[in-house]
């Protein structure tokens, strides 16, 4: 039976040309994660954490993508294509996949802050 | 055109050590993790394991572990594996496998090491 | 360590033969399973990820099937050139490990 549930950053917004942090957090379970996938708006992959063989990185985006803190993502060099949702997969033993999403809104303006709270979708 | 270029066959001593590299070309050479796997005559292959060229991270089979070391040469574009205390078990064919685009699979081989340990 | 089981280890057929060869997995791996195609003397070529995507340049005739421990490579039409030894891995733990490898030969 599948008890957690994932919170993640929810809605946040950033300036083109600065960084965001992707994170996501399973709670309200013991189960083990295995692996981490994050994946982009059109579900292309931007990268994997897995627990034994640590991280991989898509290739196009090695030179943007800086893995943690954690079982998180750095997205760096923002572009204004970056604006849409992402989501978390958590594999987990024994109870199986979580997905979380977060809505990323690059932002031109040079007053745009950085926002970013945990909610459970 | 991807390729990735082996060094030559070895003959080593029990007890000794042996490196073995691989020089990448058409691509960027710190944007792929690379593996190592090896093959013994007639046996199945056997991850020995990857690195990250970029950071110099590594992640090891246990069963390596305390024999073996990938190291690369980013300035070359070319990975290292090398593995110590040889015995005759060890003699197989060592190939570099870069990392897929989706995961820790490989898309490119080398064309394989001969490695022969005996005394 | 995820233990990897294939049948047959070996099989005789013609050209024209459409061939199926199983990949048994020890835990549940989801779909991150590869298939490699290996001849004598050659180093092995990927021909499938992720279960069932097909590796750039690899024909049509080739497809995977399957999930969690289970999974099936199948060669529609079987070429001469198709003649080998296949191999599955999977790519989701430490340490990666492939199968024994299923020889395709002729009949």
């Known amino acids: 039976m599948m008890t957690g549930t994932i919170e993640t950053t929810g809605n946040i917004s950033a300036k083109k040309g600065g960084s965001v942090i992707l994170q996501c957090h399973l709670s309200s379970t013991m189960a083990q994660v295995t692996q981490v996938n994050w994946e982009q708006h059109d579900h292309s992959l931007l990268a994997i954490r897995n627990a034994e063989l640590g991280w991989h990185i898509y290739p196009a985006f090695k030179d943007r993508v800086a893995p943690g803190p954690g079982l998180g993502l750095t997205l760096q060099s923002l572009t204004m294509n970056d604006t849409g949702e992402y989501f978390c997969t958590y594999h987990t033993y024994p109870d199986g996949t979580y997905r979380g999403r977060i809505f990323l809104e690059v932002l031109e303006s040079s007053v745009a802050e950085h926002s970013a709270r945990f909610q459970i979708p | 055109e991807v390729q990735l270029v082996q060094s030559g066959a070895e003959v080593k001593k029990p007890g000794a050590s042996v490196k073995v590299s691989c020089k990448a070309s058409g691509y960027t050479f710190t944007n792929y993790y690379m593996h190592w796997v090896r093959q013994a005559p007639g046996q199945r292959l056997e991850w020995m394991g990857r690195i990250d060229p970029d950071s110099g991270g590594s992640k090891y089979n246990e069963k390596f572990k305390s024999r073996v070391t990938i190291t690369v040469d980013k300035s070359a574009s070319t990975a290292y594996m090398e593995l110590s205390s040889l015995r005759s078990e060890d003699t197989a064919v060592y190939y570099c496998?870069?990392?897929?685009?989706?995961?820790?699979?490989?898309?490119?081989w080398g064309q394989g090491t001969t490695v022969t340990v005996s005394s | 360590d995820i233990q990897m089981t294939q049948s047959p280890s070996s099989l005789s057929a013609s050209v024209g033969d459409r061939v199926t060869i199983t990949c048994r997995v020890s835990?549940?791996?989801?779909?991150?399973l590869a298939w490699y195609q290996q001849k004598p003397g050659k180093s092995p070529k990927l021909l499938i990820y992720?279960?069932?995507t097909l590796a750039e340049g690899v024909p049509s005739r080739f497809s995977g099937s399957g999930s969690g421990t289970d999974f099936t490579l199948t060669i529609s039409s079987l070429q001469p050139e198709d003649f080998a030894t296949y191999y599955c891995q999977h790519h989701y733990g430490n340490p990666l490990t492939f199968g024994p490898g299923t020889k395709v030969d002729i009949k």
């Open positions: 496998a870069r990392e897929g685009h989706y995961g820790f699979y490989s898309d490119y």
């Open positions: 835990e549940n791996i989801y779909s991150y």
């Open positions: 992720n279960a069932k």
